[in-house]
């Protein structure tokens, strides 16, 4: 199988991006993305640009960030197209007719491309020290870059299954990402974990007529809790259910409901879990001015999120149209979706070489999530 992506991330509009360190010619890189089920990535304006920059800034690849790295993207100037010195993309264009942001909202050119109207030319994204995007650079298509960026598109997503009593969670996304945490997952993602007593469990995100759901997931948690309480989707004891302000920060496990005191779970007659307290990461997103409580919260369809319209591939789109899903590692709330790519992403590299992303946001807890980039 493919070596796993060095890093991957997703935006709230439904596109996932993966970054790969591999010395390749442009054609081989484009083929690698297609074989993974995606396409060589466009890096247009706005959210797409921020998503790719966040991937780069998550840390250097092989070599430790001592030199500038060049990454293939879906940017080229076709034969018979001229260099246009006054255009932001200098006559180059993205190999996709997807609607994008303003071309003026793009990176600068590290070097001005050669003036020509005859030869086909490709372009790369140059990253200073492998992490800080410097801008575009013209490059002959048959030369080798240090890596490439792929993009994927999915129509429906699975929200992260709540662990309950599960441990050792591992996600395998369909485009070969291995991760310890994916907040939203495309169909084909497999989650494996251990329940109490080291019993292995595995569920897969599948798409159906309604949306996407976790196959073989009985109930709403991977592993049932032995007790009555869950906090942030994990089993908890009552003493751990109070937040910093003394509020009740847990929800009741299946078969229990919130007691009259508002701070404990009691046996439920109906057996339906009831949510309680404030600041609870619940399965129903909190209502906000921009995010009213939806009537149906799960499964998530990309075209339902935040009133966005779905990305529809053009009929003759030379780059495979691929889905966007919210960024790995954020909390499962709609407010997190809203902030996922507006928030500044900071990342550090763990000793094992995995990437830890941290989100500066007041709208959700910013628990660091590790992306495991080891091979299968």
């Amino acid at each position: 199988e493919h070596p796993t992506a060095d890093r991957a991330g997703c935006s709230a509009s439904g596109a996932c991006y993966s970054l790969h360190h591999a010395t390749m010619k442009r054609q081989a890189a484009e083929e690698a993305c297609i074989l993974r089920g995606g396409a060589l990535s466009t890096v247009r304006a706005g959210a797409e640009l921020r998503a790719v920059l966040a991937l780069l800034r998550a840390g250097p690849g092989p070599g430790g960030g001592s030199k500038d790295l060049l990454f293939w993207v879906a940017l080229e100037r076709r034969r018979s197209h001229c260099t246009l010195e006054n255009e932001p993309l200098r006559g180059f264009s993205w190999l996709s007719s997807d609607p994008g942001g303003l071309e003026s909202d793009t990176l600068q050119w590290v070097e001005e491309p050669q003036r020509s109207c005859t030869a086909r030319r490709c372009a790369v994204l140059q990253a200073t020290g492998g992490v800080e995007p410097a801008g575009w650079k013209e490059m002959r298509c048959h030369l080798r870059a240090n890596g490439y960026l792929c993009k994927y598109q999915f129509e429906v997503l699975c929200p992260a299954p709540r662990p309950g009593a599960a441990s050792n969670l591992s996600y395998r996304a369909p485009f070969q990402l291995h991760s310890a945490a994916l907040d939203f997952s495309p169909p084909g993602t497999e989650v494996s974990a251990l329940c109490r007593g080291q019993l292995p469990i595995s569920v897969t995100c599948i798409a159906d007529e309604i949306g996407a759901r976790w196959d073989k997931l009985s109930g709403d948690v991977l592993c049932p809790c032995p007790g009555r309480y869950l906090r942030a989707g994990k089993c908890a004891e009552l003493p751990n259910c109070l937040d910093d302000l003394g509020g009740f920060a847990c929800e009741c496990a299946t078969g229990f409901e919130l007691g009259k005191d508002g701070r404990s779970c009691v046996t439920s007659g109906e057996g339906q879990p009831t949510l309680g307290g404030t600041g609870v990461p619940t399965r129903r997103p909190p209502a906000t001015a921009t995010s009213p409580v939806p009537q149906r919260t799960w499964p998530i369809r990309v075209d339902e999120k935040l009133g966005e319209t779905p990305l529809v591939p053009e009929q003759d789109n030379s780059v495979t149209s691929i889905p966007e899903i919210p960024r790995w590692g954020s909390q499962s709330t709609m407010s997190t979706l809203q902030m996922s790519l507006q928030a500044e992403s900071k990342a550090t590299i763990t000793p094992s070489g995995s990437v830890i992303s941290k989100f500066n946001s007041t709208t959700s807890s910013a628990t660091p999530q590790a992306f495991d980039s080891s091979s299968a």
């Epitope: 199988e1 493919h2 070596p3 591999a22 010395t23 390749m24 010619k25 054609q27 081989a28 484009e30 083929e31 690698a32 297609i34 074989l35 993974r36 089920g37 080798r144 591939p313 009929q315 003759d316 789109n317 030379s318 780059v319 495979t320």
Partner: antibody, heavy 119, light 108 residues
Framework: EVQLQQSGTVLARPGASVKMSCKAS????????MHWVKQRPGQGLEWIGA????????SYNQKFKGKAKLTAVTSTSTAYMELSSLTNEDSAVFYC????????????WGQGTSVTVSS | QIVLTQSPAIMSASLGERVTMTCTAS???????LHWYQQKPGSSPKLWIY???NLASGVPARFSGSGSGTSYSLTISSMEAEDAATYYC?????????FGGGTKLEIK
């Protein structure tokens, strides 16, 4: 001149495994994906999978996962495909093929390796 | 996966006759990634037309290709004896790569 030279005809028993080779010349072996295609007698073409010799990246058609295993040896510019647990359905001609600048069309093909599975 | 359906499966044409065969995709395919191959009995397939309309090296000018989206075609303006073969369309817009079932062209 680009050439892909494949190993010869194979006769195998059901349940056995076979490994065929494809020796490349005339281009930089490590810079291009090598694909494998199956053609049963009198039938059409099926893509099996591909390998990128530069880093041993592989990609398989879901239908052939567990059936075919692709490898490459860069020192000899040779790609290999191993087929396991052979059945009559595996009787076919297998081609190695790679693109070379024509928008991902498979524009160089080996002569094919014929595999016959019979008890 | 994208299914490519070729029609007709078998056709015969007289020498000098104009011939058209079609390839229909189950979902939209970029014209850049739709190709045609010619195969004769006992031989490997040969790239014949790439990216919908570009003739591969050595292919006679009487061949042409066109189409977009889900509908593509290969046309021979004037059939010659050497054109008798099976023609396959092939897409690489989405993985896995897929081929059509082929159109066998015979001389009438």
């Amino acid at each position: 001149e680009v050439q892909l030279q494949q190993s010869g005809t194979v006769l195998a028993r059901p349940g056995a495994s076979v490994k065929m080779s494809c020796k490349a010349s005339g281009y930089t072996f490590t810079s291009y994906w090598m694909h494998w295609v199956k053609q049963r007698p009198g039938q059409g073409l099926e893509w099996i999978g591909a390998i990128y010799p530069g880093n041993s990246d592989t990609s398989y058609n879901q239908k052939f996962k567990g059936k075919a295993k692709l490898t490459a040896v860069t020192s000899t510019s040779t790609a290999y495909m191993e087929l396991s647990s052979l059945t009559n359905e595996d009787s076919a001609v297998f081609y190695c093929t790679h693109y070379y600048g024509s928008d991902y069309a498979m524009d160089y093909w080996g002569q094919g390796t014929s595999v016959t599975v019979s008890s | 996966q994208i299914v490519l359906t070729q029609s007709p499966a078998i056709m015969s044409a007289s020498l000098g006759e104009r011939v058209t065969m079609t390839c229909t995709a189950s979902s939209s395919v970029s014209s850049s990634y739709l190709h045609w191959y010619q195969q004769k009995p006992g031989s490997s397939p040969k790239l014949w037309i790439y990216s919908t309309s570009n003739l591969a090296s050595g292919v006679p000018a009487r061949f042409s290709g066109s189409g977009s989206g889900t509908s593509y075609s290969l046309t021979i303006s004037s059939m010659e004896a050497e054109d008798a073969a099976t023609y396959y369309c092939h897409q690489y817009h989405r993985s896995p790569r897929t081929f059509g079932g082929g159109t066998k062209l015979e001389i009438k």
